[in-house]
């Protein structure tokens, strides 16, 4: 199926808590974080990044015509292509991954389609043929999701459907200082 893009723009998505939570508060302001509330992470931590957008999952909006052989949609459709980096995970709060984000390697997140939508389009064909209606499946939103053994590479390349399954839970280790109250909920969120 051929397509012609004649307009595109980008939207930065707000990641959902549990999959790819918002950056730590000090990325948004300069307040010192409370160690106890943040799983023992020191204030002014170097895990901050100077440019958050450098590691963001973006929704690129492409406007294109749907084609089917010689036929082309009467109006262009707008769909999303998921683009950008979901890592390094230094942007993830300490609660994710059982507070293990101090490790040198950890969960790999990818920017892939989250939701799809079906859109009905009218195809105009040359030679006076009657218009045809057709349903197309378009990416509606993107999300940073943890890479799992159930992802194959073609899904990632082609922005195919996500088949993630939560990792089997492991017992969290006790911490010397108190962690966030919702840490247990987040521990197996990915």
């Amino acid at each position: 199926q051929g397509w012609q893009a004649f307009k595109n723009d980008a939207t930065e998505i707000i990641p959902e808590l549990g999959e790819y939570p918002e950056p730590p508060p000090e990325l948004e302001n300069n307040k010192t974080m409370n160690r106890a509330e943040n799983g023992g992470r020191p204030p002014h931590h170097p895990f901050e990044t100077k440019d958050v957008s450098e590691y963001s999952c973006r929704e690129l909006h492409f406007t294109r015509y749907v084609t089917d052989g010689q036929c082309r949609s009467a109006k262009p459709v707008t769909e999303l292509v998921c683009s950008g980096q979901c890592g390094p995970a230094r942007l993830l709060p300490n609660a994710i991954g059982r507070g293990k984000w101090w490790r040198p390697s950890g969960p790999d997140f990818r920017c892939i389609p989250d939701r799809y939508r079906a859109q009905r389009v009218q195809l105009l064909c040359p030679g006076g043929a009657a218009p045809r209606a057709r349903k197309v499946r378009l990416v509606a939103s993107c999300k940073c999701k943890r890479l799992t053994r159930f992802h194959n590479q073609s899904e990632l390349k082609d922005f195919g459907p996500e088949a993630a399954r939560p990792q089997k839970g492991r017992k969290p280790r006790p911490r010397a200082r108190g962690a966030k109250a919702n840490q247990a909920e987040l521990e197996n969120a990915y």
Epitope: R90, R103, S105, D108, R149
Partner: antibody, heavy 119, light 110 residues
Framework: EVQLVESGGGLVQPGRSLRLSCAAS????????LHWVRQAPGKGLEWVSG????????DYADSVKGRFTISRDNAKNSLYLQMNSLRVEDTALYYC????????????WGQGTTVTVSS | QSVLTQPPSASGTPGQRVTISCSGS????????VNWYQQLPGTAPKLLIY???QRPSGVPDRFSGSKSGTSASLAISGLQSEDEADYYC???????????FGGGTKLTVL
Amino acid sequence: EVQLVESGGGLVQPGRSLRLSCAASGFTFDDYALHWVRQAPGKGLEWVSGINWEGDDIDYADSVKGRFTISRDNAKNSLYLQMNSLRVEDTALYYCAGNSRGYGGLDVWGQGTTVTVSS
Amino acid sequence: QSVLTQPPSASGTPGQRVTISCSGSSSNIGRNTVNWYQQLPGTAPKLLIYSNNQRPSGVPDRFSGSKSGTSASLAISGLQSEDEADYYCAAWDDNLESYVFGGGTKLTVL
């Protein structure tokens, strides 16, 4: 200049103990998670143990679990590895290493201290 | 035997492009980020690539990393004599609960 300097290595008999130290300078010590990585003569790298910024979360390789203990003293800018029940196969160059960003690899390394376990 | 598998050796001539592979499983590379280290003869290892494809400051852009499924690779373009070293891949292994290294690849610049 960011620096990690290991010490405490030496020749020891099997079954005995040894304590390695790693002194840090040139950076904010508790901004780094710290690790011990070893390299047997002519062999590859083997991760031994890791400890988070505050010393309250620790991981060990199966090969040293129950025998080695990692600890840190942020007030002294020091990392330690207490090695008990040493075996011949523990003979290696022991590196102290640190990572300053989550899931960002070991970006600071010391030059290593040699541990030889032999009778 | 290492959890991550690397070819023991690789070689190339100056200016050439060389790729070093690293094969793992679903419990390490398949789920977690990959890092690459360079160890020049007689020196401590140095971080070359983190988080699959990110370069620390100071590492030339001749070095690049990629990951696909349960394998990762390090590419070195415009090979130079000073690139002659041992290269190691590493990743966290969820089953072993350990940071695992590949066996290392000795790169020779001919």
